[in-house]
Each structure stands twice: as C-alpha cells, then as structure tokens.
C-alpha cells in the first residue's frame, strides 16, 4: 500500500505557451499524480520526471495563451493545488487606418489575439512619449478598433496595445500615426500685372511648413515653401489678367493639407 | 489485499429508506475518497456520488438523480463508508458497489466491492 | 453534467480479430477516462486509467487512446475470456459519469 505524500512546491513558472512546475517531496519515498486543467480541457496527466532524490518536475509545452491552467498533485486523496495562468499574447497586427485619420482623430485596428483575452488596453503617446489617452477596451470578436479623439492637427503620435487576461499582461506592440494639419485660413490675394502677394491665417494645431503652388491648367508654373510661421508669399513674373490655380499646402507630421483659390493677375 | 464488503441492501418500499454499509480494510482507508456505484438489473453502470477524506473537510458530491435524497458518510474510526438512501423510488433498484479511488504513481485505480443489491417495490 | 455515448451497444466478432469500442464526452474530459469490462454476476473490473494507460496485470492486447472528447478502447485479438460488457467512465468533473456499455461477443 503507497504512503501518503507530504509535499512543498518549488517553483512554478509560466509563460505564454509552457509552464514548469516543480515539488519536494518530504519524508519517505510515496506515490503521487500531478494531473492539470483549464475550464475547457478537462483533466489530464501531467508527465513527471525526477530532477534528484526528493525533486520531481513536470513542464507542459504548446499551451494555450491567457488561460488558467490548475496543477493538482494528489496522494490518495491529499492533494495541493497551484494555480497558474500562461501569459496572453498582444495582437498579431496593429495598425492605424490612414484612411479614417482626421485632423483630430486616429482610429486604430488590431486582429484578435491568439489564446484567453480579458480585455485590450490601448494607449496613445505623444512625440515625448506623454501619454495623453488611454482606454481599457473588453475583448470582443467583432470588435477590435478604436478612435482617440480630440488630438493635435499635425502631430505625430504613438499608440500601445497590450493583451490582458485575469491579473495578467502581455508585453505591448506598438504602431504610430499622425493626425493631418489643418489647412490655413482667411486665403487673401493682393494683385498687381506681374505678380500676387498671398497672405493667410494659421490652423490649429502643428506645422512644419507651407508649401504654395500656382498652376495653369493642371501644370505647375511657380512654386515656393516657408516657414511655418510664415503668413505671405509672393509670385512674381506672371503673365497680366491671367488666371491661375493657386494651392496653399499645409505640411506636418509626414502627412498634408490644403486650400485651392482661383486668382486672376490684374491686366496690363 | 484491499477489500470492501457491502451490506445492509434488501428490500424496501417505495418512499422508504435504508442505510448501506461498506466495510474496508487492506488500505488506508482515512486517506482515500470513495464511491458508491449502482448498476439496476440488466443496465450499465451509474455513479451516485464520492466523499473525500478528512483533509478535504469530507466533502461529497452526488449524481442529480439522487441528490437530496440520498447522503454518504464516513466514519473513519470504523474504516466504514455508509449510503443513507431517503425517500426511495423503483428506479433506485439496483446493485450497490462500494468503491475505493486513489490516484497515486501517475495512476488513478479503482477497487470494488462485490456489491448490495437494492430492492424498491410495493 | 458531461454525458459519456459508447459505440457500437453491441459488437459480435470472430477469435483473434480486432473489437474496437468508442466512447465520446459531451464536453472536454481532457485524458481523465477510464474503461471498464464487467463479466456476468462480478463487479466491473479496471483496464485503462488516464485513457490510455493499462492497469496492473491487464492483458497488452487491451489499448486505450483519444483526449478532449473522442476515445477508444481496442482488443487486438480477441479471446474468449474478453466476452464481456465494457464501459467508459470520465473522472475530470464531477458527477462522474460512465458511458452506457457496449456488449462484445464472439461471432
């Protein structure tokens, strides 16, 4: 007839896919089980091996992420239970849709990750790495976006995800985005023969430069960048009571806005 | 060698009530949980419920079919397992085993008894 | 509670050929079955614990296998002593529950 057991845990160790457990068994030699399970695997035997006299070990391998995993090692009927849960996995893609971007909105998308998710946590950082907003989003299958409103026109930004399962985090993976720039305000046109001295209002938020274009029937004929905090430029050499497409182009952030006038050169 | 001798089956009536016994010895028995099993004449072979050992604060667990009709204990000093049966039905006829489940070595064993049977008619 | 289907109820088959019984779980038992063979007038006697694992002094031509849902208990070549009823019994939750039998005999 086997002795009873009177066992001590080790160590226990996790991570997203194994887990390794291992145990002191005290006294004299005896039979023991460590059987293991999850809400939905049922309960099965864990393969043990001995480590030295009285340390025996048992690691499982290809598990499911995000899951609690029970480890029972049973003598008879004693038994000591350990609990442990495998790491979640963040998502395998993150991204943020350039086409749904506004001057003061982001939206951020993620495939589902692989394994037991709770939650998602999303946060949005600025350039100096500030965090500005963040959101504890509940995990879903048919839902696995976000927008952050009420940003910065022409700012860059960079956005987090991180899985959460139980009291348990994955590692973050991270994308960046950048909200457009405004367009500049209040175009006004000065107009002489030869030249147009263009002066505007700044938008809200960031800009790195500005950019003017005047083209005649879709062809560039003059050109010219300043500064961001400049407010006038002038095109000079043009042909008198001519009619060009003058683009005032707001840059920022890697990406660009713009406003479009038609203007008239005075006649000679 | 483990042994588990069952007794104090016969018959009863319907809405009666009898207690069964099992007898163990050959083992520990303090330290194992055991089972009752009932197989009715003729049929397959149904769990009725476990106890656990003292450590386990002797919890039980029943089949739905006889749950708050029929209650396992345990005395320990005895090395005796008992079934009080309550408020009995004719589909409660059966063979009653004793049954002792360890798990130990990797394993998880079963030891039977020979069995009691059970009669519930008018 | 996790409801245990044996198949075939019966199975006749000749000395030395090969009887395979299946059992399924209604519900992910993970490796916790066990199997069963019951003579007339005797308790059930253990074969396979842990699905696939023979118990002491039980004959290598009984093999048990399956995890989750799906298992199977094999008899290589069957004997005349094997004609008996065998049944599946899941331990991972509880109510335990045992499957309904499958009656094996020789054709």
């Known amino acids: 007839e086997p002795e009873r057991c009177n066992f001590t845990l080790a160590e226990s160790k996790a991570s997203s896919h194994s887990v390794s457990i291992q145990w002191r068994i005290l006294g004299s030699p005896c039979n023991f089980s460590l059987i293991y399970s999850s809400d939905t695997l049922g309960a099965a035997l864990c393969p043990t091996f001995r480590i030295d006299n009285t340390t025996y070990g048992c690691n499982l391998q290809d598990l499911q992420a995000g899951t609690i995993y029970n480890f029972r090692i049973i003598s008879l009927d004693e038994e000591r239970t350990v609990v442990l849960q495998t790491d979640p996995l963040p998502p395998a893609r993150f991204g943020v849709s350039k086409e749904k971007t506004t001057s003061t909105s982001l939206h951020v998308w993620w495939t589902p990750s692989s394994g037991k998710v709770t939650s998602y946590e999303v946060q949005l950082f600025d350039e100096n790495n500030q965090k500005i907003q963040g959101v504890q989003i509940q995990e879903s299958t048919s839902w696995n976006e976000y927008t952050f409103f009420n940003l910065t026109a022409g700012s860059k930004y960079n956005i987090a995800i991180t899985a959460v399962s139980g009291g348990k985090r994955s590692f973050s993976v991270y994308t960046n985005g950048s909200t457009v720039p405004s367009p500049v305000k209040d175009i006004g046109i000065s107009t002489k023969a030869n030249s147009l001295l263009i002066s505007w209002s700044h938008g809200s938020g960031n800009v790195e430069r500005y950019r003017l274009m005047l083209m005649d029937k879709g062809i560039l004929v003059h050109g010219g960048v300043v500064d961001k905090h400049a407010t006038s430029y002038a095109f000079h050499g043009l042909t008198p009571g001519y009619l060009y497409n003058l683009t005032v182009m707001t840059e920022a952030a890697g990406l660009q806005n713009y406003r479009w006038k038609l203007v008239r050169t005075a006649p000679m | 060698e483990v042994q588990l001798v069952e007794s104090g089956g016969g018959l009863v009536q319907p809405g009666g009530s009898l207690r069964l016994s099992c007898a163990a010895s050959?083992?520990?028995?303090?330290?194992?949980?055991m089972n009752w099993v009932r197989q009715a004449p003729g049929k397959g072979l149904e769990w009725v419920g476990r106890?656990?050992?003292?450590?386990?604060?002797?919890?039980?667990y029943y089949a739905g079919s006889v749950k708050d009709r029929f209650t396992i204990s345990r005395d320990d000093s005895k090395n005796s397992l008992y079934l009080q049966m309550n408020s009995l039905k004719t589909e409660d006829t059966a063979v009653y085993y004793c049954?002792?489940?360890?798990?130990?070595?990797?394993?998880?064993?079963?030891?039977w008894g020979q069995g009691t049977l059970v009669t519930v008619s008018s | 509670d996790i409801v245990m289907t044996q198949s075939p109820d019966s199975l006749a088959v000749s000395l030395g050929e090969r009887a395979t019984i299946n059992c399924k779980a209604s519900?992910?038992?993970?490796?916790?079955v066990a199997w069963y063979q019951q003579k007339p007038e005797q308790p059930p006697k253990l074969l396979i614990y842990?699905?696939?694992t023979r118990h002491t002094g039980v004959p290598d031509r009984f093999s048990g296998s399956g995890s989750g849902t799906d298992f199977t208990l094999t008899i290589s070549s069957l004997q005349a002593e094997d004609v008996a009823v065998y049944y599946c019994?899941?331990?991972?939750?509880?109510?335990?529950?045992f499957g309904g039998g499958t009656k094996v005999e020789i054709k």
């Open positions: 050959g083992f520990t028995f303090n330290a194992n949980a």
């Open positions: 842990w699905a696939s």
């Open positions: 049954v002792r489940d360890y798990y130990g070595s990797s394993a998880w064993i079963t030891y």
């Open positions: 106890i656990r050992t003292k450590s386990n604060n002797y919890a039980t």
């Open positions: 019994q899941q331990y991972s939750s509880y109510p335990f529950t």
């Open positions: 519900q992910h038992v993970g490796t916790a």
